[in-house]
């Protein structure tokens, strides 16, 4: 058959939850301390909460069924009677009472024909302001007749026909009734919620609703123009040209900021936005949702997209509607012919209307922003240059911030890219130019996106001119090739000698993408003597083992995820893992990760890695490779300092010569 509607699916779930109590029993969730009841979907069932309020489960007959004394559940279908009597069956006795008062309407409800009645519950009538109720029942009851006819449709309409955004023609002057059928199974009629649906009658169907509904006459734009509280909004809409859309056809939700909402914004920010047509348009579009969203539809947090493209979290807390967790809606469900308005008393400024400074204020990067300010780079963060700011998280500076000297200033300039980027368009191997003149490389991994050693830690915030990338560490631009890095660090003197002996110097000096796991001098010294001698005594073996320390792509620690198998130049794969922020290679911890080079990255290790297939080498002739001899001397374990090793005299002389 046809796909079930959300309402029917929720009803089916409630029926499922109630079936252990007998046939046609539905589980209903009642919000504690109120009379609000809901058929329950899966999520609500397990959370036992609606709008953050606890619920109790009760079991009732599903719509259309009743109990039979002495039998389990609700085995009997309700007897069909006319619409008037069915109002009593669903508990809408006040509607019956007012129907009687009109004189004309009861005969219609009891007579031939086919009608749909959206019948307000007794509580709905009782909650009407006294003056409204008085006006309905005076004037020879004509207003009451009109109000009741507005709740009626001249044909049978069941919930499976109630589609989201449709309009029904009422029996009062053919005025429209707005129907919304939400994915969570809630159905609203002019924003009144369907409480009990599809109660069949001989001459139609009754749906019980939680409010008395009234005709809708104005569009959104007209409401803005009428209300004094929207004076600033009115001016902003006029300036942006959005009035055409807001008076046209469609179904929108306007989260309408009151004058008070605009007053809360610093005048400098407000004037900047109001004076910038694009920022203003984005600001207003951020208050408009693409479809009508009634307050009754919200029973839990819901992500909605604004016309500007930002996602808002609309939720509720008891009777209050919230946006992004804040109860800023002061008046809800003001119906317009083209949607619904909720008054809000805080402005929702989208990122697209903000400066980099403003973006950063809401991110966890305040320490970095202070550094940029102190370094005299503030004008770049508030101006109209197209830039991308790479701002490290506050946690990066937990051990303190660097002094603002020339080096720091330069480092910070290399955290500002000369273009407004979006991370979704970045690609592996792309180079980005900084204000400091450096070229930074982009590395795209399965679960992360990194720029040099620093990876993006949060979604981009794309501002009016600048984009903020929140980074997981201070970015260090490369200062030379891998070989330059190793030569410039005395921890690697033995590795450098080994690389030279193995003929790998050129490889690590040329353009390329390498990940080098660099054993320190201590790592070489820590080798058992036998392994050390095997390494030093065979140039082929040495090259083989060194190549096993070189991955054939750039892998920074932020790109590791849980486990990466990195192919080495030797052919075997290296198992690189990240656990509790510690990088390991072949289960051995890396002492210092991410020393960037122009042709790769160096990770410092304190052990020499052994390839899995490192079988004992066949005996070969004694090598006459002079580079190897030099390495053997350099490695006499760079130990003029290590007292228990002494070079044979002939080589001691050679070393002396090499020193001069």
């Amino acid at each position: 058959g046809p796909a079930k509607s959300p309402y029917q699916l929720v009803l089916q779930h409630s029926r499922l939850r109630g079936r252990q109590h007998g046939p046609n029993v539905c589980a209903v969730q009642k919000v504690i301390g109120t009379n609000r009841k809901y058929f329950t979907n899966c999520k609500q069932w397990y959370q036992r909460k609606i709008c953050g309020k606890s619920t109790v489960i009760s079991y009732e007959c599903c719509p259309g069924y009743e109990k039979v004394p002495g039998e389990k559940g609700c085995p009997a279908a309700l007897p069909l009677s006319n619409l008037y009597e069915t109002l009593g069956v669903v508990g809408s006795t006040t509607t019956q009472l007012y129907t009687d008062r009109t004189e004309k309407l009861r005969p219609e409800m009891e007579g031939p024909g086919s009608f749909t009645i959206f019948a307000p519950s007794n509580e709905a009538w009782a909650s009407l302001p006294a003056e409204v109720l008085d006006s309905l029942v005076s004037n020879v009851n004509i207003e009451l007749l009109n109000a009741l006819r507005y709740h009626m449709v001249g044909r049978r309409v069941l919930t499976d026909e109630l589609k989201h955004g449709m309009t029904l023609t009422s029996m009062y002057q053919n005025s429209n009734i707005q129907i919304h059928h939400y994915p969570n199974g809630i159905v609203t009629v002019n924003c009144a919620r369907l409480l009990k649906a599809d109660h069949h009658a001989t001459n139609g169907v009754v749906h019980l609703i939680d409010k008395v509904i009234s005709t809708i006459t104005n569009n959104i734009q007209q409401i803005i123009e009428i209300e004094d509280t929207f004076e600033t909004l009115r001016a902003a809409v006029a300036a942006s040209g959005l009035n055409t859309m807001l008076e046209g056809n469609g179904q929108y939700t306007l989260l309408a900021p009151t004058n008070e909402a605009f007053e809360k914004i610093p005048s400098e920010t407000l004037n900047r936005i109001l004076g910038d047509p694009e920022a203003l348009r984005d600001l207003l579009n951020n208050h408009i949702l693409k479809s009508a969203m009634c307050a009754e539809a919200i029973v839990a947090g819901l992500s909605v997209e604004t016309l500007e493209g930002t996602t808002l979290e609309v939720g509720c807390s008891g009777d209050m509607l919230t946006i992004n967790g804040k109860a800023i809606i002061s008046n809800k469900d003001i119906l317009a012919t083209n949607g619904v308005i909720h008054y809000i008393d805080e402005l929702l400024i989208p990122d697209s209307a903000k400066t980099l400074f403003e973006l950063a204020a809401e991110s966890d990067v305040s320490t970095a922003i202070d550094l940029f300010r102190q370094a005299g780079l503030g004008n770049h963060l508030s101006g109209s240059e197209r830039l991308t700011l790479l701002a490290p998280l506050n946690s990066v500076f937990k051990d303190g911030t660097p002094p603002i000297d020339a080096h720091t200033r330069n480092l910070l300039r290399n955290h500002i890219i000369k273009d407004q980027l979006a991370s979704k368009y970045l690609y592996h191997g792309q180079t980005l130019e900084t204000l400091g003149g450096k070229k930074l490389r982009v590395f795209v991994y399965r679960n992360s996106l990194c720029i040099e050693n620093s990876c993006i830690a949060a979604h981009d915030k794309r501002g009016r001119y600048g984009t903020l990338f929140t980074m997981d560490r201070v970015l260090t631009p490369p200062m030379g090739t891998v070989m330059d890095v190793l030569k410039g660090d005395n921890r690697f003197s033995m590795l450098v000698a080994a690389i030279q002996s193995a003929g790998l110097t050129e490889t690590l000096n040329r353009e390329g993408v390498y990940t080098v796991f660099a054993p320190t001098n201590e790592a070489f010294r820590a080798l058992p003597p036998r392994e050390r001698s095997r390494l030093l005594g065979d140039a082929k073996e040495l090259a083989n083992i060194l190549k096993y320390h070189i991955g054939d792509e750039i892998l920074v620690s932020g790109g590791i995820g849980a486990l990466v198998r990195l192919k080495s130049l030797q052919g075997d794969k290296l198992e690189v893992s990240l656990k509790n922020n510690v990088v390991s290679v072949n289960k051995e911890p890396v002492a210092e990760p991410d020393i960037m080079a122009t042709n790769g990255v160096v990770h410092v290790i304190t052990n020499v890695l052994q390839p899995p297939a490192n079988r004992p080498q066949e005996r070969g002739d004694e090598l006459a490779d002079s580079a190897l001899e030099i390495f053997k001397q350099a490695s006499a374990f760079s130990r003029a300092s290590q007292r228990s090793v002494r070079l044979a005299p002939v080589y001691q002389k050679l070393l002396e010569r090499m020193k001069h």
Partner: antibody, heavy 120, light 113 residues
Framework: QVQLVQSGAEVKKPGSSVKVSCKAS????????MYWVRQAPGQGLEWVGT????????YYAQKVQGRFTITRDSSTSTLYLELSSLRSEDTAVYYC?????????????WGQGTTVTVSS | DIVMTQSPDSLAVSLGERATMNCKSS????????????LAWYQQKPGQPPKLLIY???TRESGVPDRFSGSGSGTDFTLTISSLQAEDVAVYYC?????????FGQGTKLEIK
């Protein structure tokens, strides 16, 4: 078969020097690490020093560092241990030992030993 | 330095019986990269140089009778002679070649009961 023939016994005074030799045969001398191990009278074994297959570097026990020198001569397949600044505690049988292969390893083949006595 | 400690210092076993001696190192001799234990066992008979019996803690040197076996890993090692023969009377030494300086145990003297 592998043979390591060591020079004869030596009696020396404290502070003097002596050079002990070990002539190898039955294998390619330059393909092996070589070692000296000593054993004081009634005592256990003590490693003295190592020389690599090509004679490029030598390792020494702390006790003898700076006083003893190990050298090798591939042309004559001979290993040497020069003991200088002798002390009475250097009295021991000195064994010339061949490693397992061309890499630093365990002590595979032993010479018959040379007794060095240091006494005033 | 790695300290090697053998136990017992001396051992008397009847001919044909099993003889077991232990060797403990002050730090692990297992090299994780190749999962090998850098330990050897030697036999020294009176007036003779020592003779290699076992290397890699459990690999028997060629020509060594199969009644000799080595076991253990990390810091605890054992040399076992499954059925003692008269010619097995000697002092047995363990030795580590995991780190310089290479060190020996003090020896276990094996006698016939």
């Amino acid at each position: 078969q592998v043979q390591l023939v060591q020079s004869g016994a030596e009696v020396k005074k404290p502070g003097s020097s002596v050079k002990v030799s070990c002539k190898a045969s039955g294998f390619t001398f330059s393909d092996y690490y070589m070692y000296w191990v000593r054993q004081a009278p009634g005592q256990g074994l003590e490693w003295v020093g190592t020389i690599s297959d090509g004679g490029i570097y030598a390792y020494y026990a702390q006790k003898v560092q700076g006083r003893f020198t190990i050298t090798r001569d591939s042309s004559t397949s001979t290993l040497y241990l020069e003991l200088s600044s002798l002390r009475s505690e250097d009295t021991a049988v000195y064994y010339c030992v061949r490693g397992w292969d061309r890499y630093d390893s365990w002590f595979a083949c032993w010479g018959q030993g040379t007794t060095v006595t240091v006494s005033s | 330095d790695i300290v090697m400690t053998q136990s017992p210092d001396s051992l008397a076993v009847s001919l044909g019986e099993r003889a077991t001696m232990n060797c403990k190192s002050s730090q692990s001799l297992l090299y994780s990269s190749n999962q090998k234990n850098y330990l050897a066992w030697y036999q020294q008979k009176p007036g003779q140089p020592p003779k290699l019996l076992i290397y890699w803690a459990s690999t028997r040197e060629s020509g060594v009778p199969d009644r000799f076996s080595g076991s253990g890993s990390g810091t605890d090692f054992t040399l076992t002679i499954s059925s003692l023969q008269a010619e097995d009377v000697a002092v047995y030494y363990c030795q580590q070649y995991y780190r310089y300086p290479y060190t020996f145990g003090q020896g276990t003297k094996l006698e016939i009961k």
